[in-house]
Interface confidence: low
């Protein structure tokens, strides 16, 4: 007897991090034998949506014309073939930015830092939030994720980097969020350019992936080193 049907592949275009109001397409790719595709959204009635396959039947398109809070969440897809339903795909986490006002990102003591020294990136929100994310442009997403302990809300989070190397140089943004839905993020902060001078190391590795793309298994987040910040936030490496 044949084993279970192979699980489909689920992804989003242009990526899994979408700003409010923008369109996004969710794709589910199964096999040529697929007769129907089904998309489930966590904590929503199931099936969340169903679509007939597009020729040559090995994938289906689920369109979201305008991103709102409704659509943020965790998805899985399935396909039905003549022998039954497939295993679920790996989950896709669709994140919406623009749910809250943008935080402010600054560098202490300065965004111009000498290699080997320390710098702390400070993300500050106007209203208290309990989750902060630091993103480095053209790096895996998210770069750093700080969540407050015991649900305590903070106006800021510290991201210390020590010792700084040339790898830390680049453009950063931060987001704030509430822990009860990490699928809803604030508008991004204005970009902060961290410039590392006096480096004796070789050139920085060339970037390979943009922030808006869902990180694949080959992506290795670039993680600043350093002690756990003392802002009441627990560090989560993801």
């Amino acid at each position: 007897q044949a084993g279970p049907l192979p699980k489909p592949t689920l992804w989003a275009e242009p990526g899994s991090v979408i700003s409010w109001g923008n369109s996004v397409t969710i794709w589910c790719q199964g096999t040529l034998e697929a007769r129907e595709y089904r998309l489930d959204k966590e904590e929503s009635p199931a099936p969340w949506d169903r679509q007939n396959p597009l020729e040559p039947k090995n994938k289906a398109r689920f369109s979201i014309p305008s991103m709102t809070e409704d659509y943020a969440g965790r998805y899985r897809c399935y396909y039905r073939s003549p022998v039954g339903w497939s295993q679920p795909s790996d989950p896709l986490e669709l994140v919406m930015t623009g749910a809250y006002s943008k935080p402010t990102l600054s560098a202490l003591p300065s965004p111009l830092v000498t290699s080997g020294k320390s710098v702390t990136l400070l993300c500050q929100s106007r209203s208290p939030m309990d989750t902060f994310l630091l993103i480095k442009e053209r790096a895996a997403h998210p770069l750093l994720h700080l969540r407050s302990e015991h649900g305590a809300q903070q106006h800021q989070a510290e991201f210390p980097m020590s010792p700084v190397t040339s790898v830390h140089g680049g453009t950063y943004r931060c987001f704030s969020s509430h822990g009860f839905s990490h699928y809803l993020l604030s508008h991004p902060s204005d970009p902060l350019e961290l410039i590392v001078s006096g480096s004796l190391e070789g050139p920085r590795p060339s970037p390979t992936r943009s922030v808006s793309t869902a990180a694949g298994p080959e992506d290795q987040p670039l993680m600043p080193t350093g002690s756990v910040p003392h802002s009441g936030l627990r560090r989560h490496w993801e």
């Epitope: 949506d49 809070e69 009860f180």
Partner: antibody, heavy 121, light 107 residues
Framework: QVQLQESGPGLVKPSETLSLTCTVS????????WSWIRQPPGKGLEWIGY???????NYNPSLKSRLTISVDTSKNQFSLKLSSVTAADTAVYYC???????????????WGQGTTVTVSS | DIQMTQSPSSLSASVGDRVTITCRAS??????LAWYQQKPGKVPKLLIS???TLQSGVPSRFSGSGSGTDFTLTISSLQPEDVATYYC?????????FGQGTKLEIK
């Protein structure tokens, strides 16, 4: 079958805060928008604001400075607080759920019975 | 903010008449429009949403049309139980503004 029930005082004094709670029964509060709407005597419907189950909110600009909508997922409830009320806030207050089906969201398909709030000294 | 304007504000028609209520948005709202019926002393009921999709259990004499800025609710053959105030509402983005309502009476 999802049902909504508003609760709170029927009489509020001017300048005080109006507080109402909507209890969701027969279903989960998760993954829906939950709204408050009001209707002054003899007048039309006015959208007050919504809260998503995650806590994200959006308010009617004309009420924003006085309005707070919150959610308690553990109790399957969401609440409205309107501060500094005047006689103009006298109305029937409804809670409602924004509808959903197969990947699409639409108008408010489930409503509470409404609760009359009078602002008077 | 986008304004929603309904017309007429009231109308009187005979049983069996074809009745049309219009709703105009001050900006394009695609088809993110809902129509509600509120009978006297009752809770509003969702009839149509999005603009042309009849909700389950709503009689087929009701229909909706339009997209962008101009929308229409039509009752093909007016019945006595259709006496109510009808509201349109946009929901493409907040605020989810209602029209001012159209009061429908039987002649």
């Amino acid at each position: 079958q999802v049902q909504l029930q508003e609760s709170g005082p029927g009489l509020v004094k001017p300048s005080e805060t109006l507080s109402l709670t909507c209890t969701v029964s027969g279903g989960s509060i998760s993954s829906y928008y939950w709204s408050w709407i009001r209707q002054p005597p003899g007048k039309g419907l006015e959208w007050i604001g919504y809260i998503y189950y995650s806590g994200s909110t959006n308010y009617n600009p004309s009420l924003k400075s006085r309005l707070t909508i919150s959610v308690d997922t553990s109790k399957n409830q969401f609440s409205l607080k309107l501060s500094s009320v005047t006689a103009a806030d006298t109305a029937v207050y409804y809670c409602a759920r924004r509808g959903y089906s197969y990947g699409y969201y639409y108008g408010m398909d489930v409503w509470g019975q409404g609760t009359t709030v009078t602002v008077s000294s | 903010d986008i304004q929603m304007t309904q017309s007429p504000s009231s109308l009187s028609a005979s049983v069996g008449d074809r009745v049309t209520i219009t709703c105009r948005a001050s900006q394009d709202i695609s088809n993110y429009l809902a129509w509600y019926q509120q009978k006297p002393g009752k809770v509003p009921k969702l009839l149509i949403s999005p603009a042309s999709t009849l909700q389950s259990g709503v009689p087929s004499r009701f229909s909706g049309s339009g997209s962008g800025t101009d929308f229409t609710l039509t009752i093909s053959s007016l019945q006595p139980e259709d006496v109510a105030t009808y509201y349109c509402q946009k929901y493409n983005s907040a605020p989810w503004t209602f029209g001012q309502g159209t009061k429908l009476e039987i002649k």
